[in-house]
């Protein structure tokens, strides 16, 4: 039975040209995390594998940095980066857990971080 929950940075906003850290955290399970995939809508951004380490998709290499931890740092943000991001935790023996983050990239300088929330 899957007992874990994913805590994410929730709905967040950031300024155009700036950077943002996307973070997810898996809790309430002793399952082993074997891999975390980061996706933006229908695009694979990056993968962190327990054995192989990080792979950043070549088309995002200039603007995506691994970490901190299992998180992902997006740099040189543009308005086109606005949208949903998913962290997909592959675990053993539980299976797959998915967390969602919504990022809004703002033109103005009034970008504030949203509250954290949990996805069961």
């Amino acid at each position: 039975m899957m007992t874990g929950t994913i805590e994410t940075t929730g709905n967040i906003s950031a300024e155009k040209g700036g950077s943002i850290i996307l973070q997810c955290h898996l809790s309430s399970t002793t399952a082993q995390v074997t891999q975390v995939n980061w996706e933006q809508q229908d695009q694979l951004l990056a993968i962190c594998n327990a054995d192989l380490g990080w792979h950043i998709s070549p088309s995002f290499k200039d603007r995506v940095a691994p970490g901190p931890g299992l998180g992902l740092t997006l740099q040189s943000l543009t308005v086109n980066d606005t949208g949903e991001y998913f962290c997909i935790y592959h675990t053993y023996p539980d299976g797959t857990y998915t967390g969602r983050i919504f990022l809004e990239v703002l033109e103005s300088s009034v970008a504030e971080h949203g509250a954290r929330f949990q996805i069961p």
Epitope: T34, E39, D42, Q43, A50, D51, L52
Partner: antibody, heavy 118, light 107 residues
Framework: EVQLLESGGGLVQPGGSLRLSCAAS????????MSWVRQAPGKGLEWVAS????????SYADSVKGRFTISRDNSKNTLYLQMNSLRAEDTAVYYC???????????WGQGTLVTVSS | DIQMTQSPSSLSASVGDRVTITCRAS??????LNWYQQKPGKAPKLLIY???SLQSGVPSRFSGSGSGTDFTLTISSLQPEDFATYYC?????????FGGGTKVEIK
């Protein structure tokens, strides 16, 4: 240089068994998921089975479930496919492939031919 | 199971032609789509992974695009060594499935 070398193919009667081996070299075998893919004569590619790296998580195609067993020996850098209750429709070239991040198959062996016929 | 449908199943083209092969998934597979080239009697060779990433050592005339259910492999200027069969493959979920293949022949 990454190399995958399959062996163990041959002619076997229906209902018989074979064990295929895939000897890996040139990379840290234990860090990679691995798969078997087959190709019947004149046909397309068909995935057979996969095994993960660290946890040994296994999955099979429905067509071979209960008859084939994928396994690995990380100390020998070798992937195996035990094939039992073989049928004529299992006749194919069997390839082993390395699967980084369980997403793409970046290196393939040269294949070994399995022929099931009476 | 996710079905992968490739089109066309075969095509004739000349050296220098721009060639486009499409692959459609029966459900969304995000960008978990790979393209392989296979020549007679040889093992498949990875060309494109994760829909659009060019595998190391593969010529830049090969490119991939698409996400969700619709994907494309493009060869910008067909070379003599490109005459082969091309397969798409989804790795979104097991069972892993391949398209039926597209044979690129000399016109």
């Amino acid at each position: 240089e990454v190399q995958l070398l399959e062996s163990g193919g041959g002619l076997v009667q229906p209902g018989g068994s074979l064990r295929l081996s895939c000897a890996a070299s040139g990379f840290t075998f234990s860090s990679y998921a691995m798969s078997w893919v087959r190709q019947a004569p004149g046909k397309g590619l068909e995935w057979v089975a996969s095994i993960s790296s660290s946890t040994g998580t296994i999955s099979y195609a429905d067509s071979v479930k209960g008859r084939f067993t994928i396994s690995r020996d990380n100390s020998k850098n070798t992937l195996y496919l035990q094939m039992n209750s073989l049928r004529a429709e299992d006749t194919a070239v069997y390839y082993c492939a390395r699967v980084p991040y369980s997403v793409w198959m970046d290196y393939w062996g040269q294949g070994t031919l399995v022929t099931v016929s009476s | 199971d996710i079905q992968m449908t490739q089109s066309p199943s075969s095509l004739s083209a000349s050296v220098g032609d721009r060639v486009t092969i499409t692959c459609r998934a029966s459900q969304s597979i995000s960008s978990y789509l790979n393209w392989y080239q296979q020549k007679p009697g040889k093992a498949p060779k990875l060309l494109i992974y994760a829909a659009s990433s060019l595998q190391s050592g593969v010529p830049s005339r090969f490119s991939g695009s698409g996400s969700g259910t619709d994907f494309t492999l493009t060869i910008s200027s067909l070379q003599p060594e490109d005459f082969a069969t091309y397969y798409c493959q989804q790795s979104y979920s097991t069972p892993l499935t391949f398209g039926g293949g597209t044979k690129v022949e000399i016109k």
